[in-house]
Interface confidence: medium
């Protein structure tokens, strides 16, 4: 018999009080963690890293900082105004030796369109990435560099789930040893060839992503080469065999009836916590119908919510979710009609998702008013449309060319939307701000590995 492969990276996910504030409840936060982990699990499992296959992820533990923890002096993430480098450093100052990777999710608007930051793994002599153990660094502090952070906010707007999932996959890609994509082979979205360009860039593209192009949730050959080398050397250090559910991670997995976390986190009257004996933990307490950990259609009194109760808000493209009275899960919402306007009239609904461009409503295709084409910089944050496969017709929605569709009304992109051919993001003043993708990590490396550049730390 062949021994089972070590192919699972166990995660510790923390969320700060701002992430909780945005999503509102522990259950909603756990659902977000779950959807992010499922998304990267799908991406990595379906990628062949030069013969290393079925790389998967499992949440080993979560910690949700609620608004009540905002003033808790033991909560390192309580500070309101901290930059992305400092935020990653706060995560790294904790000991994460028990995990393959440790992430913090937040809802902060970091400078310059930065959606995440992570330490980059390397096959040897590494300081950072998967399986890296806590040690002293030359800034005199002990750190775990198997870490990363992501935020769901950009220039005052919340990024769509598909973009946030790709951000997570991108940062984890750094941990797994991939730098940013470069060169024509690995940045097809920058190609002059329309056929190549339309598939977009890969996960490790340095700048912006819309998340809806064919390549956006795939790794490039450049990334695969780099990640394969790191997996070859590192995965035996901390990856585990996949299989058993983890009672205590707050997620109800196969074989568990419920999961309200460990005794210090479990606020649930319905479920035995993870510190209970083997036969009881992650099981419903006697006489209880359900646990809120199973889904939003279970009351704190451990009973299914009645048929008419709302469990999901109405959104641009889907009607509200209504409990059905016999399960804790919130049933799928009915989609609104295709081509309903969404995202403040910049997009349209397709199959219940705000996914298409407003251009599609009129049989057109969205294009980028990119400055390299001699366009006015002011148009970089306009929604621009073109006739299908004819870039020469690309013009702003406010142009005379499209006045019969838009009546001369300029539709502007939402703040945080990609602009200038994915080189940057629109800010709140509708300026396209270029992304300095490598700046924050370079600054943090200098602080940790060359602290003499940062005088007067203590004395």
């Amino acid at each position: 018999t062949t021994s089972a492969e070590k192919n699972t990276c166990q995660l510790y996910i923390q969320t700060d009080h701002l992430f909780f504030k945005y999503y509102g409840t522990r259950e909603a936060v756990i659902a977000q963690i779950s959807s992010h982990v499922k998304a990267i699990d799908t991406i990595y499992q379906t990628t062949d890293f030069s013969g290393i296959r079925n790389i998967s992820f499992m949440v080993k533990r979560i910690r949700i900082n609620t608004t009540a923890d905002e003033k808790d002096p033991t909560n390192p993430f309580r500070f309101p105004n901290i930059g992305v480098e400092k935020f990653l450093e706060l995560n790294s100052e904790q000991n994460h030796d028990d995990y393959c990777l440790a992430y913090v999710f937040t809802d902060r608007d970091f400078d310059d369109g930065v959606l995440g930051l992570a330490w980059v793994g390397a096959p040897s002599g590494s300081s950072g990435g998967i399986c890296e153990k806590s040690k002293l660094y030359s800034d005199g502090k002990k750190k775990s560099l198997n870490t990363g952070i992501i935020t769901v906010q950009n220039y005052g707007s919340h990024v769509p789930p598909k973009v946030s999932h790709i951000t997570f996959a991108h940062e984890v890609g750094h941990n797994f040893g991939s730098p940013h994509d470069s060169g024509t082979e690995c940045t097809p979205g920058e190609s002059k060839n329309l056929g190549q360009k339309e598939n977009g860039n890969y996960i490790m593209y340095a700048r912006a992503t819309s998340g809806d192009k064919l390549n956006n949730n795939k790794f490039s050959l450049c990334s695969i080469r780099n990640i394969s080398q790191v997996l070859e050397k590192k995965r035996n250090n901390c990856f585990v065999e996949s299989g058993q559910p983890i009672c205590g991670n707050g997620m109800v997995e196969q074989g568990e009836e419920c999961d309200c976390g460990y005794s210090d986190q479990c606020k649930d009257e319905c479920c035995f916590d993870a510190n209970q004996p083997e036969g009881r933990k992650c099981k419903l307490k006697p006489g209880k119908q359900c646990s809120p950990s199973q889904g939003p259609c279970c009351t704190a009194q451990c009973a299914f919510k009645s048929k008419s109760e709302k469990c999901r808000d109405d959104s641009d493209c889907a009607r509200e979710g209504i409990c059905n009275g016999f399960t804790a899960l919130c049933p799928a919402s009915d989609p609104k009609p295709n081509f309903t306007d969404c995202n403040r009239h910049t997009q349209v609904c397709i199959n219940g998702q705000c996914a298409g461009s407003i251009c599609e409503k009129y049989g057109l295709e969205e294009c980028t008013c990119a400055s390299s084409d001699g366009k006015d910089d002011k148009e970089l944050c306009h929604v621009c449309c073109m006739k299908k496969m004819d870039p020469s017709t690309c013009a702003s929605t406010g142009s005379v060319q499209w006045s019969r569709h838009f009546s001369g009304r300029t539709i502007t992109l939402q703040p945080g939307s990609p602009c200038n051919d994915f080189r940057g993001y629109c800010d709140v003043f509708m300026r396209c701000r270029l992304v300095d993708a490598d700046g924050p990590l370079a600054r943090l490396k200098k602080a940790i590995f060359s602290p003499e550049l940062y005088e007067n730390i203590a004395e």
């Epitope: 030359s138 800034d139 005199g140 602290p451 003499e452 005088e455 007067n456 203590a458």
Partner: nanobody
């Protein structure tokens, strides 16, 4: 020019103690981090102890056995090493931010 001079190394039996000293010549401004590093044979140079202001940090392998301290009047940083183990063998280097490395002092712990 500022220089660092380490001393106090030697051969000691497992369970024994040593005190390493690192004196700096010349005046240094803006000193923020003082640290001791160990380079075991065939290994990289790793920090074992550091002092920043009043706070100290130790590598897991030496916690509870080694103590870092400094004497500002004498421009010296010390490493008190107790309950020494054979795996503590190596060349010990002192590092003060903004200053080049010293020559190091050899510590050999025999079993």
């Amino acid at each position: 020019e500022v220089q660092l001079v380490e001393s106090g190394g030697g051969l000691v039996q497992a369970g024994g103690s040593l005190r390493l000293s690192c004196a700096r010549s010349g005046r240094i401004s803006n000193i923020n981090i003082m640290a001791w590093y160990r380079q075991a044979p065939g290994k990289t140079r790793d920090m074992v102890a550091a002092i920043i202001g009043d706070s100290t940090n130790y590598a897991d392998s030496v916690k509870g056995r080694f103590t870092i301290s400094r004497d500002n009047a004498k421009n010296t940083v010390y490493l008190h090493m107790n309950r020494l183990k054979p795996e503590d063998t190596g060349v010990y280097y002192c590092k003060i931010s903004g200053v080049d490395w010293g020559q190091g002092t050899q510590v050999t712990v025999s079993s």
